[in-house]
Amino acid sequence: SQVSQNCHNGSYEISVLMMDNSAFAEPLENVEDAVNEGLEIVRGRLQNAGLNVTVNASFMYSDGLIHNSGDCRSSTCEGLDLLRKISNAKRMGCVLMGPSCTYSTFQMYLDTELSYPMISAGSFGLSCDYKETLTRLMSPARKLTYFLVNFWKTNDLPFKTYSWSTSYVYKNGTESEDCFWYLNALEASVSYFSHELSFKLVLRQDKEFQDILMDHNRKSNVIVMCGDPQFLYKLKGDRAVAEDIVIILVDLFNDQYFEDNVTAPDYMKNVLVLTQSPGNSLLNSSFSRNLSPTKRDFALAYLNGILLFGHMLKTFLENGENITTPKFAHAFRNLTFEGYDGPVTLDDWGDVDSTMVLLYTSVDTKKYKVLLTYDTHVNQTNPVDMSPTFTWKNSKLPNDITDRGPQ
Amino acid sequence: SQVSQNCHNGSYEISVLMMDNSAFAEPLENVEDAVNEGLEIVRGRLQNAGLNVTVNASFMYSDGLIHNSGDCRSSTCEGLDLLRKISNAKRMGCVLMGPSCTYSTFQMYLDTELSYPMISAGSFGLSCDYKETLTRLMSPARKLTYFLVNFWKTNDLPFKTYSWSTSYVYKNGTESEDCFWYLNALEASVSYFSHELSFKLVLRQDKEFQDILMDHNRKSNVIVMCGDPQFLYKLKGDRAVAEDIVIILVDLFNDQYFEDNVTAPDYMKNVLVLTQSPGNSLLNSSFSRNLSPTKRDFALAYLNGILLFGHMLKTFLENGENITTPKFAHAFRNLTFEGYDGPVTLDDWGDVDSTMVLLYTSVDTKKYKVLLTYDTHVNQTNPVDMSPTFTWKNSKLPNDITDRGPQ
């Protein structure tokens, strides 16, 4: 059943669900700061456009009575609980800044008819793809699978002359929320990644991963994993690695690679890091002083969620259109708006597009260097370093299957 | 976090969750009638034992604000919502008569630390197995898999001389809640059934099922499905069926086979029906006049849940033991109590044991006849009709794989 909305003439509210369970362990006050900073910008933009309206946020907190709080694994019902709370309090805004946890978001769409727009800083899983009123402002798993397939197939670059069609995936179940769903998408037999590969095996134990590094009978030279360099080191340590092994370390929301004076440790030499180009505008922001490089992206997604709300409000108000209609609920997609850090593009399904960056460790300088970028909007790889100083033979990425001659 | 309990000296309450989403489409007033009838019996039994205490039920209704109500597929969070409602109202009883929907029950255990006993008339899925404070009063999927494996392996009966190790499973996603989880358990690669079979294939389309009936290249002669004869007829119609096909129709909660003057339709001749021996004591009960043969079992489970609560109350009070302890919460298992219809046995994990009955259609009388019974408590098959008048050749069940000679 529907909830009445605080979305009247001249007064527009965004309901922000402040969940005990979150995709990133971010203090709720930081999220609140990001939202408030976003509101200030939106108010300015609306005033600048001659729209004299009031814009506010209502923060809806969990009561903590029931849920095991903490990570997203026990978050399934928390979003619905808050929706009930909003419903009882008659405090639904024009838009819901919803859960970041995939389970929670999925459940809200499963159990209710959501006829108002929901913006999420997370909801990474494939089960949240193609939701007609959902907008996701951090790269969802589908975008990762498209990059990987594109990269696997690429065979016309100076440093990658082989198409790949095989992979190991390391997934031990202790991953962060983003990694959990990224790896789930790679594991899922129905996913694009699985569909396009001729061989894929999930390694679940540390020992399986460690054994593959020097196993002459391995079925692939490529291992995809997700986490930061420290996570890899705990697993790999200083073990010897066969020369044609390539580890792809997915670490999208981590700006540390771009910080000054960062040197790549020796254990990263066989590793390509997939990340995103950093947003540096938050560095001096009032609410971001205490943010880690990872959390910066999460806070930025909340801030951009508010700016998106403002953008849509401005568009509809300027066109004299009603905000509480299905048209508004379905409009948060297939557009570009001005985010805090520059233009933000949403695809046809409301998912953020971004520039992914593949880094390698230069054997000369021990620095992370950009090998290529990938624009998720056009599904296109753009080589950057045509003569990388790789650890791999001839400074080229090896084939994914080693030719061992007659056996 | 924990909820205070209405479970004091001399006054004991059972909290009954009255869900919009239910395993069987049963009007809530019928459930309430069953509970109230059970309470009358419990009060009598306690008074008879010289225990002058008050026993009541508090019925907790969903507010219907959020959930898509109806079947169990959108029930995940409803149990938790009611638990929150109980928590806010400070109305938790000694025991929770909980959700019948698997999703809902599973979620309650996933998201909370349930330290009080929960009784369910349903929660059929494997994901609700082995919950330390959960009691299930309708046969869960695990029990079905144990019967099927036992029956497949049996090869020393006059009418079954072959061990089977293959099966098709028909599962099109429109099944009732009990069937949905029974078939899920057969499909699951980790289940006992899958583990013990050398070949198993799930048929998801009507046409796949229909084609198998006469397919010379089929990999198994045995098809397991779940539903009533009408469901089978819609699927199979009057199509010809190869003579060595055996359809196992799981229809546990349906007493119609045992009613007087029931004749088996012709399309049931290749079918073995797995059901349970009927509880006829409900037929004249005040609350069961309007119950269908299926719903009788559901109402009976609620009634028996109340009787189990009474049994445990009596046991602990007579022993001078505290009711609001972990010991009480973990005690609803590995016992036999007097149900409405006779003794009810719970296994080590709190799941009801029953006598399953395998019926065949007599080609002579066109009546359903008992072929064998299976006691889930001891995992034992007991043949009943040693000379069944089967449709199958030599009145014996065929091998599961037809020997086609040299190909």
Partner: antibody
């Protein structure tokens, strides 16, 4: 108080490349778009294009193929290059700051640089 | 692009009188319109944004109105320092475009 200070060559020959730089003092650089606007002698204002601290640009299509706007955040500076100039490009060139990020109107202006294109 | 047309090209007004300047857009710009004042040899100065909101430090005698395609800048009582060229500018879309200007001169 925010101040914009601009400099660059004032006299160019046709076909040369105009090059101007604008430095920002006394305010945040990252929260704004920074524009170039020109005004031919005795005429009205023409917006050339804009850039933010990340290098995202929007240009006037009438000039686009000739315009390059760049940014150096380490120095809080942005620059304009206009290639293949002709006498029609003679104007006072202003750098300006939007009143707020993407606001599209300009509350702080440089002092202006007269660029003359003459053979 | 959106073409901005100002009228009149020149407006002669006596000090202390009211001046009314018009600006028309070739298509709707909602209220995304700004007004600037420019004196000889100086950079333009922002007066009004959002069609009617005065920028910081702008006297109350300056007021803006209108929406869509028709806009007006009114100077309530002209002071000697108000004689200048006034430009309207739309910022609804890119490219940002200015009107050709109205020169307010002493009558």
């Amino acid at each position: 108080q925010v101040q914009l200070q601009q400099w660059g060559a004032g006299l160019l020959k046709p076909s040369e490349t105009l090059s101007l730089t604008c430095a920002v003092f006394g305010g945040s650089f990252s929260g704004y778009y920074w524009s170039w606007i020109r005004q031919p002698p005795g005429k009205g204002l023409e917006w050339i294009g804009e850039i933010n601290h990340r290098g995202n640009t929007n240009d006037n299509p009438s000039l686009k193929s000739r315009v390059t706007i760049s940014v150096d955040t380490s120095k809080n500076q942005f620059a304009l290059k206009l290639s293949s100039v002709t006498a029609a490009d003679t104007a006072v060139y202003y750098c300006a700051r939007e009143r707020g990020y993407t606001y599209g109107n300009f509350d702080h202006w440089g002092q202006g640089t007269l660029v003359t294109v003459s053979s | 692009e959106i073409v901005m047309t100002q009228s009149p090209a020149t407006l002669s007004v006596s000090p202390g009188e009211r001046a009314t300047l018009s600006c028309r857009a070739s298509q709707s710009v909602s209220r995304n319109l700004a007004w600037y004042q420019q004196k000889p040899g100086q950079a333009p100065r922002l007066l009004i944004y959002g069609a009617s909101t005065r920028a910081t430090g702008i006297p109350a005698r300056f007021s803006g109105s209108g929406s869509g395609t028709e806009f007006t800048l009114t100077i309530g009582s002209l002071q000697s320092e108000d004689f200048a060229v006034y430009y309207c500018q739309q910022y609804k879309t890119w490219p940002r475009t200015f009107g050709q200007g109205t020169n307010v001169e002493i009558k």
